[in-house]
Amino acid sequence: SAPGEDEECGRVRDFVAKLANNTHQHVFDDLRGSVSLSWVGDSTGVILVLTTFHVPLVIMTFGQSKLYRSEDYGKNFKDITDLINNTFIRTEFGMAIGPENSGKVVLTAEVSGGSRGGRIFRSSDFAKNFVQTDLPFHPLTQMMYSPQNSDYLLALSTENGLWVSKNFGGKWEEIHKAVCLAKWGSDNTIFFTTYANGSCKADLGALELWRTSDLGKSFKTIGVKIYSFGLGGRFLFASVMADKDTTRRIHVSTDQGDTWSMAQLPSVGQEQFYSILAANDDMVFMHVDEPGDTGFGTIFTSDDRGIVYSKSLDRHLYTTTGGETDFTNVTSLRGVYITSVLSEDNSIQTMITFDQGGRWTHLRKPENSECDATAKNKNECSLHIHASYSISQKLNVPMAPLSEPNAVGIVIAHGSVGDAISVMVPDVYISDDGGYSWTKMLEGPHYYTILDSGGIIVAIEHSSRPINVIKFSTDEGQCWQTYTFTRDPIYFTGLASEPGARSMNISIWGFTESFLTSQWVSYTIDFKDILERNCEEKDYTIWLAHSTDPEDYEDGCIAGYKEQFLRLRKSSVCQNGRDYVVTKQPSICLCSLEDFLCDFGYYRPENDSKCVEQPELKGHDLEFCLYGREEHLTTNGYRKIPGDKCQGGVNPVREVKDLKKKCTSNFLSPEKQNSKSN
């Protein structure tokens, strides 16, 4: 049951009648197989649903797929399978939806083995019409749209060719052979790795990184001895094999690969990996795997150049086997990230940072919860959040943590309260302040979603039995109402709402099972009549993000500035509306040493905010010293934290030191010490 589901709760009047008038059922006329759903464009109301049904026969697999379209947010669907000539669509490629509101859709068809190439169906009018196009190659990946121009597509073929189209898939040209990985960069640039000898796998570590800025007319080799590459924010990363051994290091470029700098990060061996956890135009979170099959590594955060890294979090959980990490960007509040660490006793604990990785702490225990059996002290424990790792371990966790940029401060997640993550059935917790404080929102596991920028939260109990009840809250999860959306319960498979959390419609997907058949069914509920009026000024209140000490003038300062938001009052039952824009008022803070990170060759001693020169350079610091670019070795010891906007206050600038003379080591030959590599 839901906390607060009682008479004292602020109940919405006559909600059953209001919702009953706005509940739309659609039964899909096909056998149950798999279903995939895509939204086409933003605020268009257009949804495409692809159902596929496989019958494995002795010799081959017989498949059937159907395509449905809605233009009213899922209230009604029309079977448009005839628009794609009743062709079987390959679900592993999904539906390739164009960027922004381009209205473009590409579906990749299943073709018989002997055909010269694949087949696609293209639409540029929000799936009203489709054009069939036969391809001169068999696609290995989904078509990738250029973020800048939705007419430009790229795809890899099963024979490792890189194919490009300049007219939205009408004509295709192979611009390079022997390609392993290709990605769009900015300004219609394509980056890709190629192999020279055997194959992608055989040449791993000996690949070349190429760039084309004119869709394949001309090329530039921008890296050799490449293991892999990645793009994050304005940074281009490549892991490059070392000359002497089988280790590799990260190199970074901020000019599309024209010039590279070695990142001051540990090198990794064959069995280890690097992973970009998050990146924006200011900085990067990088995970570096620990040697051995430990299942953990270290998070480092970068400076504004992506070159100098500070250790952010030890023993960060990231399984090598399944590639699972709980690292989550809390998009509803700037600077907040949540992840899991593997403690010495092999228990998993949740950590949170409010300052972009500067400091990590445990989550505060919710006031209305007691510590579970994992807690040594029944009065002192923390909230631990279930995310990707718990889901991969098949714990009773139907959903990862949820936050939305336009539902300021709201975070919803499954969790348990103790000294570590518990394998017991979790409850659902909510934070309304970006993760500083938490409250139990619902008992037991649930599916949940945010509508109308936080004005409504919807939840459905996770159950193995058929369901017919949905819960909703208009006060950020304090009080819940239940609505029976159908007399005949369905086997629930998922909640679907338009990405961006601006919609007031929710679709409940599931299937009905009778003696002979099972059919897909959706119920779309429009909450517009629950939120009868538009919100006015009086419905909003001011909230200072990151506030921990009202007495302190610097209260709320993160990365050199604080932000006051206008937020909907919990008791206001009104529509934020589709055009709602988060209102925030930033104010600049005075600088303190906390606004600076230690530059290369400097470190912060325990419990000290000053950066102190390292007495000697060892390990990866020494390697950076030897192979890094000379201009990066001249420093005053401090660099402003990326994105920090502070002004005035402390200015820790001091004399500039040249650290080149420290670049010596008994372990390196004299000639290495004299030569500099850029």
Epitope: R11, D433, Q478, K538, I542, P550, Q564, K570, S571, S587
Partner: antibody
Framework: QVQLVQSGAEVKKPGASVKVSCKAS????????MHWVRQAPGQGLEWMGW????????RYAQKFQGRVTMTRDTSISTAYMELSRLRSDDTAVYYC?????????????????WGQGTTVTVSS | DIQMTQSPSSLSASVGDRVTITCRAS??????LNWYQQKPGKAPKLLIY???SLQSGVPSRFSGSGSGTDFTLTISSLQPEDFATYYC?????????FGGGTKVEIK
């Protein structure tokens, strides 16, 4: 210690204006809302509005809209409330009160520090 | 505007008595309800905020409960200094509104 000190009693004629000051000390002035509440003789409490000293933003009760102006001078940690076009039923004790804050929320947690009150008498 | 109705408007009680004052909002105000004590010629004093949180420095004999529309202020054992007028106030929806007050007198 935290305190709010208000200006002295005022006697005004109908149609005139009155400006009451409220000097804050012992805390960060810009970090808390300042509310103004009045109490007519023998009556209950009536909220007039608030000012956010940090931004200068205000919100007034509908009843006083157009007649009340709330301002602040952060350099001397002082809030002001000016009421114009005075009538005899504006005779009351006027209080400034600091809005209690909780984890970033500026409203909703009551008024935890009050001034001593300023008596305004409107009489012809 | 949200109307706040306090009851009773006055009550007589003796030292040591348990006293209960109720406050009803004309619509749900979640838990944004505060209680004040006012003595003659003095400014009000915050006792309880957010329906049930005790303001620092206030004796623990004062307690608050409720959420939504119905709220209660309880004085578990009335003391001589508790004879005063008590006001509830909602701070959830603008304009902020106060109840009419409950005067607690000596029996």
């Amino acid at each position: 210690q935290v305190q709010l000190v208000q200006s002295g009693a005022e006697v005004k004629k109908p149609g005139a204006s009155v400006k009451v000051s409220c000097k804050a000390s012992g805390y960060t002035f810009v970090a808390y809302y300042m509310h103004w509440v009045r109490q007519a003789p023998g009556q209950g409490l009536e909220w007039m509005g608030w000012i956010n000293p940090n931004s200068g933003a205000t919100r007034y009760a509908q009843k006083f809209q157009g007649r009340v102006t709330m301002t602040r001078d952060t350099s001397i940690s002082t809030a002001y409330m000016e009421l114009s076009r005075l009538r005899s039923d504006d005779t009351a004790v006027y209080y400034c009160a600091r809005g209690k804050r909780s984890s970033g929320w500026y409203e909703g947690y009551g008024m935890d520090v009050w001034g001593q009150g300023t008596t305004v008498t409107v009489s012809s | 505007d949200i109307q706040m109705t306090q009851s009773p408007s006055s009550l007589s009680a003796s030292v040591g008595d348990r006293v209960t004052i109720t406050c009803r909002a004309s619509q749900s105000i979640s838990s944004y309800l505060n209680w004040y004590q006012q003595k003659p010629g003095k400014a009000p004093k915050l006792l309880i905020y957010a329906a049930s949180s005790l303001q620092s420095g206030v004796p623990s004999r004062f307690s608050g409960s409720g959420s939504g529309t119905d709220f209660t202020l309880t004085i578990s054992s009335l003391q001589p200094e508790d004879f005063a007028t008590y006001y509830c106030q909602q701070s959830d929806v603008s304009p902020i509104t106060f109840g009419g007050g409950t005067k607690v007198e000596i029996k």
